[in-house]
């Protein structure tokens, strides 16, 4: 059933991984770097999909993820045969207000304690991840192991 209450603005939050790296925008790419002084981590905009009835149940809360104030949203698309994470110029509220879920831009948000994971709705089994080395772009991965970090700490700002 469609959510009756329509939301006017997305929530805002900050994200870091278990190694205390934050997301930073660099040349239209999101990278994870250790937090330092005079650094500007991105503020995440997130909003739940209104059409949960048309999506798989029990995988998490389907959300759109964007960069607050920048009109950029995270999306998943295949490059060749490989699902990739991309930043696209898109208003997150335009996605929210559509009569259908926009799967390419949707992620199942699951929480376990303080840890959050973000699984692609368009490519089930693929998660937002960062390389354990750091200083690398965010990616999509199927490999939930030591090479990549898929657990993030999401702190809601308001």
């Amino acid at each position: 059933m469609e959510k009756a209450l329509k939301i006017d603005t997305p929530q805002q939050g900050s994200i870091q991984d278990i190694n205390h790296r934050v997301w930073v925008l660099q040349d239209q790419t999101l990278i994870a770097v250790p937090r330092k002084d005079r650094m500007s981590p991105v503020t995440i905009a997130l909003i739940s999909c209104r059409h949960v009835e048309t999506l798989e149940k029990d995988r998490g809360n389907p959300i759109y993820l964007g960069l607050n104030g920048l009109n950029l949203c995270l999306m998943c698309a295949k490059v060749g045969d490989q699902p990739t994470l991309q930043l696209k110029e898109k208003d997150i509220m335009d996605l929210y207000n559509q009569p259908e879920p926009v799967k390419s831009f949707l992620f199942y948000h699951s929480q376990s304690g303080r840890n959050s994971t973000f699984e692609s709705v368009a490519f089930p089994g693929w998660f937002i991840a960062v390389s354990s080395e750091g200083g690398c772009p965010l990616i999509l991965t199927q490999e939930l192991g030591k090479a990549n970090t898929t657990d993030f700490g999401l702190t809601m700002l308001f």
């Epitope: 009756a4 329509k6 059409h51 009835e53 559509q98 009569p99």
Partner: antibody
Framework: ELQLQESGPGLVKPSETLSLTCTVS??????????WGWIRQPPGKGLEWIGS???????YYLPSLKSRVTISVDTSKNQFSLKLSSVTAADTAVYYC???????????????WGQGTLVTVSS | ESVLTQPPSVSGAPGQRVTISCTGS?????????VHWYQQLPGTAPKLLIY???NRPSGVPDRFSGSKSGTSASLAITGLQAEDEADYYC???????????FGGGTKLTVL
């Protein structure tokens, strides 16, 4: 068996407002899973979705028509209605109402349809 | 011009097999949106024929089948019959247009 029936004037003058009503029988308009929609078909041409409404009153419109379209619902009468303002000859079409169904993982689809009503815009 | 592209017409003799294509783009069929098909007999309202690419509603003969690959979909009709003569429309959703979209329709003539 769910049935839909469109009603309203078949002739509307240019610049005026087209008004149509769809009466639903054989089922409730207040179901939690379905939307209700309007689609039109100009003579000899293809189909165009106009907009949809949920029984709570939540609406979605085709962006190119949004400034002229209003869809409303009356659950007590099991009806929903279409108003299209500032019409021109280009709005001449057969107007259909339909239930807008969903399935998990698929976009919504239209089933069943009303028989349709021809609306001509002419002075 | 329609967002989904269909051939204007196809034809076949009784008993033959015909296919109708529906070509979209990365913002509709290619964006994980399935395709539905409708049959419109002359002078009547459209009727749902296939939903979710390849599912038949009850009452639709198994002579009708659908498939989808990449940014395209197709409807196949086997054992063509005279009563299959109609217009056929594909439908999907386009997130760039924020709306449900139809193909331009294909007129099937049974020879």
């Amino acid at each position: 068996e769910l049935q839909l029936q469109e009603s309203g004037p078949g002739l509307v003058k240019p610049s005026e407002t087209l008004s149509l009503t769809c009466t639903v029988s054989g089922g409730s308009i207040s179901t939690s899973s379905d939307y209700w929609g309007w689609i039109r078909q100009p003579p000899g041409k293809g189909l165009e979705w106009i907009g949809s409404i949920y029984y709570t009153g939540n609406t979605y419109y085709l962006p190119s028509l949004k400034s002229r379209v209003t869809i409303s619902v009356d659950t007590s009468k099991n009806q929903f209605s279409l108003k299209l303002s500032s019409v021109t000859a280009a709005d001449t079409a057969v107007y259909y109402c339909s239930r807008v169904r969903y399935g998990v993982g698929v976009p919504r689809y239209f089933d069943p349809w009303g028989q349709g009503t021809l609306v001509t815009v002419s002075s | 011009e329609s967002v989904l592209t269909q051939p204007p017409s196809v034809s076949g003799a009784p008993g033959q097999r015909v296919t109708i294509s529906c070509t979209g783009s990365s913002s509709n069929i290619g964006a994980h949106y399935d395709v539905h098909w409708y049959q419109q007999l002359p002078g009547t309202a459209p009727k749902l024929l296939i939903y979710g690419n390849d599912n038949r509603p009850s009452g639709v003969p198994d002579r009708f089948s659908g498939s989808k690959s990449g940014t395209s979909a197709s409807l196949a009709i086997t054992g063509l019959q005279a009563e299959d003569e109609a217009d056929y429309y594909c439908q999907s959703y386009d997130y760039s247009l924020s709306g449900y979209v139809f193909g331009g329709g294909t007129k099937l003539t049974v020879l």
